[in-house]
Interface confidence: medium
């Protein structure tokens, strides 16, 4: 699986979409999990409704919500009030029994709030103790990176 990068602005909501083959994954519940280290397990954050027919209903765990369009074949995860510690590697999964198929590998990048003067975002330079004023990246951008080309997840 290639990894898709989703960028969101700190304090705002980020929507992550995971398309899948609706026929292949018919009747399967879905889940959103966080990758713990490069080779570590994927820790479940939230999963769709226990009744597959009700998968369209939004389920929440803290600031993370999940909903599944089973006909269209799109799993949508919403991260509310995005924070730097939300940055990292995740997976969208399709569940069957005790097994899980990976639908998409995701890297969430958290960008500083353009109005937040505490962080310089993309104009911060490590060689100076004083940072630039703003962060300047559009809300909710996604792009694909090839395997081996993934930047380290940002840290708080």
């Amino acid at each position: 699986h290639n990894t898709t990068v989703f960028q969101g602005v700190e304090g705002q909501s980020l929507q992550v979409s995971c398309p899948y083959d609706s026929m292949k994954h018919w009747g399967r519940r879905k889940a959103w999990c966080r990758q713990l280290g490069e080779k570590g397990p994927c820790q479940r954050v939230v999963s769709t409704h226990n009744l597959w027919l009700l998968s369209f209903l939004r389920r929440r765990n803290g600031s993370t919500a999940i909903t599944d369009d089973t006909l269209g074949g799109t799993l949508t995860i919403t991260l509310r009030n995005l924070q730097p510690h939300d940055a990292g590697f995740y997976q969208c999964q399709s569940l069957h029994g005790s097994e899980a198929d990976t639908l998409r590998k995701v890297l969430v990048e958290v960008l500083a709030d353009p109005l937040d003067h505490r962080d310089a975002g993309d104009l911060w330079v490590p060689g100076e103790s004083e940072s630039f004023e703003d962060a300047h990246v559009e809300h909710s951008i996604s792009r694909s990176l090839l395997e081996g080309e993934i930047p380290f997840p940002p840290t708080s």
Epitope: V110, P114, G121, V137
Partner: antibody, heavy 122, light 113 residues
Framework: EVQLLESGGGLVQPGGSLRLSCAAS????????MSWVRQAPGKGLEWVSA????????YYADSVKGRFTISRDNSKNTLYLQMNSLRAEDTAVYYC???????????????WGQGTLVTVSS | DIVMTQSPDSLAVSLGERATINCKSS????????????LAWYQQKPGQPPKLLIY???TRESGVPDRFSGSGSGTDFTLTISSLQAEDVAVYYC?????????FGGGTKVEIK
């Protein structure tokens, strides 16, 4: 698709003034820092100035400090460079560039406009 | 200011052969807090604006062919084109994104032998 289109270049006498503009489209302009980078004919790249997304903070290269002013109008999605007291050594193609974002990524430029040529000569 | 020095000034390489460009910074651009080197590479084809290829010394920008790779740490860096293609004819610039003012190397012109 992100597009940056510079304008305002031309021939100006030493000591004269010129204002460059860069019209941006395809992204939320106010969320991004922007920069000017210049390239003298047949020479390398020289960073000139940068401005934050809100326009509240600016940086300048020593070679232009006090003579050039970077500004932006977020309602018009336009970046400006006011150039005063121009010298022959300011002759260059001036590129407008969008700065990448993200925690920990220092200032890198992507993408760039096609550039506008400023010639300072008597 | 950090001075960036590139070598060679120009390079002629046969199609399919390896091209290697060096860049040296006058002070380290390694940030110890995250162990990243704040060094970027750009490609400028004739009559075009520059294009970002690599940042953090070795992280390829999305869409950049994997024949382009960056390496090095501290003050010494290398851009390698593993198998030169006709479309790689360009001037390549290194840039430090470690401290203001941002500075570029003088450029290396890559041609086909």
């Amino acid at each position: 698709e992100v597009q940056l289109l510079e304008s305002g270049g031309g021939l100006v006498q030493p000591g004269g003034s010129l204002r460059l503009s860069c019209a941006a489209s395809g992204f939320t302009f106010s969320n991004y820092a922007m920069s000017w980078v210049r390239q003298a004919p047949g020479k390398g790249l020289e960073w000139v100035s940068a401005i934050s997304g809100s326009g509240g903070s600016t940086y300048y290269a020593d070679s232009v400090k006090g003579r050039f002013t970077i500004s932006r109008d977020n309602s018009k999605n336009t970046l400006y460079l006011q150039m005063n007291s121009l010298r022959a050594e300011d002759t260059a193609v001036y590129y407008c560039a969008k700065l990448r974002g993200g925690y920990e990524v220092g200032p890198t430029f992507d993408p760039w406009g096609q550039g506008t040529l400023v010639t300072v000569s008597s | 200011d950090i001075v960036m020095t590139q070598s060679p000034d120009s390079l002629a390489v046969s199609l399919g052969e390896r091209a290697t460009i060096n860049c040296k910074s006058s002070q380290s651009v390694l940030y110890s807090s995250n162990n990243k080197n704040y060094l970027a590479w750009y490609q400028q084809k004739p009559g075009q604006p520059p294009k970002l290829l690599i940042y953090w010394a070795s992280t390829r920008e999305s869409g950049v062919p994997d024949r382009f790779s960056g390496s090095g740490s501290g003050t010494d860096f290398t851009l390698t084109i593993s198998s030169l293609q006709a479309e790689d004819v360009a001037v390549y610039y290194c840039q430090q994104h470690y401290i203001w003012p941002i500075t570029f190397g003088g450029g290396t012109k890559v041609e086909i032998k």
